[in-house]
Amino acid sequence: VPRWRQQWSGPGTTKRFPETVLARCVKYTEIHPEMRHVDCQSVWDAFKGAFISKHPCNITEEDYQPLMKLGTQTVPCNKILLWSRIKDLAHQFTQVQRDMFTLEDTLLGYLADDLTWCGEFNTSKINYQSCPDWRKDCSNNPVSVFWKTVSRRFAEAACDVVHVMLNGSRSKIFDKNSTFGSVEVHNLQPEKVQTLEAWVIHGGREDSRDLCQDPTIKELESIISKRNIQFSCKNIYRPDKFLQCVKNPEDSSCTSEI
């Protein structure tokens, strides 16, 4: 008789998940020699321990604490780039501007980026069939809790001027329900962070509106100001040009607003 298995609404664990995490870890330590002494097998063991044999709707930040002990990676606290709904451009930016870091440029973020995982209560199996969906099943699932935990720690570590890239093409440029809006904004430390600078990325080529005046940006400004952090906002009218100018800042066409 086949054993009854919980059927969740979300996609199952990414195939070859253990091998992928281990391989990513090894690759990361090779790319970042300051992490050369990290034992990736121990990292995987701690990652696995956070969700294996646990009910995938009953995961807590506490479950990830052993793994978070590795999260003391030293990222310059004044070089942090947060993003919301515009991951690809944020990552393209930090690939060019090598001294700035998104969460996915850190080891833990790099390990988990774009992956899904969950286990099953009381068995050591990884569930490759389905995992809980945040909306349809439960919010305390392994993936959501992981990103909430690492995002909180990343925001807490930030200092001086923190940048955030926001998608100006969306109806809610700033979304209170995003990870940025629900976690990171509230965990910036006012005693360390002087300013949050938002970069609103325009989608349309002919879009010359000042999206810094958008009601949701004003809402963000209000939240940030109430936390005693200054707020500034810039329109990035041409993201392609913006990246080009990051690559070649001395280009004469890069003095005008982009």
């Epitope: 020699p33 050369r36 002494h37 990290v38 990292v43």
Partner: antibody, heavy 118, light 110 residues
Amino acid sequence: QVQLVESGGGLVKPGGSLRLSCAASGFTFSDDYMSWIRQAPGKGLEWVASVSNGRPTTYYADSVRGRFTISRDNAKNSLYLQMNSLRAEDTAVYYCAREGWSGEFTDWGQGTLVTVSS
Amino acid sequence: QSALTQPPSASGTSGQRVTISCSGSSSNIGFHFVYWYQHLPGTAPKLLIYKNNQRPSGVPDRFSGSKSGNSASLAISGLRSEDEADYYCAAWDDSLSGYVFGSGTKVTVL
């Protein structure tokens, strides 16, 4: 073969300064992290400082931070340790070491003795 | 007070197996490779084991390393008189942003 030769040790009074050098040969010096490790008389090994390859990042033990400065000159295949505000507890044999790709100290010099005494 | 704890001494007769323990925490051994060094008086220390259990070329297979959780150990089988030395474990420590050594274990061949 890999050779690391330390020099610059000697007797110095408390509060004084000394600069240790390490001449490296037999490997591509600019590719590797380099470190200083010391051993006080009758005591164990103690890591002192490391310097990365590329645009150098430096790391220090709490016991020497703010007093010692590690640096490198890739053109001269040389590693240095500038030691200021020396204390009696800094008395030790100082070893220069090359780091491997996984952080291990693969090669060591023979050491140079630093004695801090009035 | 070393961040990594080793027994001060260990001994065995020629041909015996000796094991040296090294205990630390999640900030060092837990998430980082363990290295073992052999140090004979008046000579430069020598790397015996890296990445928990790997031997550099030239190191006899009588030396083996292992790691479990926040602890590691070095085993010397077929003990020989030339193995008389001080043995140190080491690892990177995240909380110190630097390497830590064990206090050292003096191995004596009886």
